[in-house]
């Protein structure tokens, strides 16, 4: 039975020294930067148990930046998980084999040299392959502050099997009250996934008014369960300008 060896390949160690200088002039300092940001766009990784996770933060800078990893904002050491992990400095990656539910969390790469520091966070969820409740990427939708008359885009990143139903809701007031007689908040349905809804994960508001300030909710459900995350919209306006409040028919958020 072939068992994995604990040793890393020498080729993967980042043992490169600073660039050789042909004269006495030092190379221009460069703060760290991402070399392939398009390969870092997938932030939410929902992975079945026992599979391998690889997070990459390809970077560069002068002098060569260092790479370290945090889990949930704290120093991440190999003995923090069964089986440890491998850092491949040459490819700016971390590899965790045979993931288990306790590996769930936020993993942050920090790339730094004496001229700057950059970081990027990935979200790992360890899932059952059988149908599960929807999972939403942390931090989305994000709070927005915009000027009166601007356009606004809220985004909700969803991972779901089976097919999810996505709703965008806004918390509203009815007769000065935010809560209905059944103790549920009043909400207005702004958008939902369906035949006429393209790109349900995005809510776009055009030419916003002050009345559209408030809390917006991305609510995602399937037959297993549901998840929701919210964000606040703040619309700023010049002084002395008043806008009438818009009243719409209320619904309850269950």
């Amino acid at each position: 039975d072939a068992l994995p060896s604990s040793e890393d390949d020498d080729d993967d160690d980042d043992s490169s020294s600073e660039e050789k200088e042909t004269d006495n002039t030092k190379p221009n300092p460069v703060a760290p930067y991402w070399t392939s940001p398009e390969k870092m766009e997938k932030k939410l990784h929902a992975v079945p148990a026992a599979k391998t996770v690889k997070f990459k933060c390809p970077s560069s800078g002068t002098p060569n930046p260092t790479l370290r990893w945090l889990k949930n904002g704290k120093e991440f050491k190999p003995d923090h998980r069964i089986g440890g992990y491998k850092v491949r400095y040459a490819t700016w990656s971390i590899i965790m084999d045979s993931v288990v539910p306790s590996d769930k969390g936020n993993y942050t790469c920090i790339v730094e040299n004496e001229y700057g520091s950059i970081n990027h966070t990935y979200q790992l969820d360890v899932v059952e392959r059988s149908p599960h409740r929807p999972i939403l990427q942390a931090g989305l939708p994000a709070n927005k502050t915009v000027a009166l008359g601007s356009n606004v885009e809220f985004m909700c990143k969803v991972y779901s099997d089976p097919q999810p139903h996505i709703q965008w809701l806004k918390h509203i007031e009815v007769n000065g009250s935010k809560i209905g007689p059944d103790n549920l908040p009043y909400v207005q349905i702004l958008k939902h996934s369906g035949i006429n809804s393209s790109d349900a994960e995005v809510l776009t508001l055009f030419n916003v008014t002050e009345a559209q300030s408030g809390e917006y909710v991305c609510k995602v459900s399937n037959y297993i369960g549901e998840a929701n995350q919210s964000a606040w919209l703040t619309v700023t306006r010049p002084a002395l300008e008043e806008r009438p409040a818009v009243m719409t028919s209320p619904l309850y958020l269950e």
Epitope: D1, A2, L3, P4, D8, D9, D11, D12, K39, H45, V47, P48, A49, A50, K51, T52, K54, K56, K86, R88, T91, I95, D97, S98, V100, E128, R129, S130
Partner: antibody, heavy 116, light 109 residues
Framework: QVQLQESGPGLVKPSGTLSLTCAVS?????????WSWVRQPPGKGLEWIGE???????SYNPSLKSRVTISVDKSKNQFSLKLSSVTAADTAVYYC?????????WGQGTLVTVSS | SYVLTQPPSVSVAPGQTARITCGGN??????VHWYQQKPGQAPVLVVY???DRPSGIPERFSGSNSGNTATLTISRVEAGDEADYYC???????????FGGGTKLTVLG
């Protein structure tokens, strides 16, 4: 060390159902592994059929999904493959295997011929 | 679904270095595993997680993975290395295990 042994009929009639079982010895089927079936038609490459976790969670090759069922029997420490509506194109050596992201243990394989 | 592309055959003289490639869209973001299969035998894992070797596999076998290509390198090739070699990934997007089409390594002479 873990060992895997495939068993089942070596000849199946067209339109029938291919049924194979993989006995796991030297380890528990409830370990943090996926239990896979992989096949290899004569003179061709490896084709992943599907896999199962001890919880019963499964994943199947999309090209075979409508015909495949993989199940696990923890009490017998074994897992099974059923492939329905077989044709001559399903003639292959069938391997059971244990893996995570990669496969570290394979059975020796069993040749299944589809013929009338 | 995800596709892995391997050259059908690679030939090399004994003592030389053989390189077998495995192409896939942004494969560098995945962990690539390599298997050796000799005629009439089950496959054997020779490299996992891009470049790690299981115990018992000679140091002559090494791997790398970047961009759209993963590579299995066999240095100081021996006659006993003649076999079919397959790359494999677990495609995280489709949640499926995927094999490359295989490469037949021929050791000349």
């Amino acid at each position: 060390q873990v060992q895997l042994q495939e068993s089942g009929p070596g000849l199946v009639k067209p339109s029938g159902t291919l049924s194979l079982t993989c006995a796991v010895s030297g380890g528990s089927i409830s370990s943090n592994n996926w239990w896979s079936w992989v096949r290899q038609p004569p003179g061709k490459g490896l084709e992943w059929i599907g896999e199962i976790y001890h919880s019963g969670s499964t994943s199947y090759n999309p090209s075979l999904k409508s015909r495949v069922t993989i199940s696990v029997d923890k009490s017998k420490n074994q897992f099974s493959l059923k492939l329905s509506s077989v044709t001559a194109a399903d003639t292959a050596v069938y391997y059971c295997a244990r893996g995570t992201d990669w496969i570290d243990t394979w059975g020796q394989g069993t040749l299944v011929t589809v013929s009338s | 679904s995800y596709v892995l592309t391997q050259p059908p055959s690679v030939s090399v003289a004994p003592g030389q270095t053989a390189r077998i490639t495995c192409g896939g869209n942004n494969i560098g973001s995945e962990s690539v595993h390599w298997y050796q299969q000799k005629p009439g035998q089950a496959p054997v894992l020779v490299v996992y997680d891009d470049s790690d070797r299981p115990s018992g596999i000679p140091e002559r076998f090494s791997g790398s993975n970047s961009g759209n290509t993963a590579t299995l390198t066999i240095s100081r090739v021996e006659a006993g290395d003649e076999a079919d070699y397959y790359c494999q990934v677990w495609d995280s997007t489709s949640d499926h295990r995927v094999f490359g089409g295989g490469t037949k390594l021929t050791v000349l002479g």
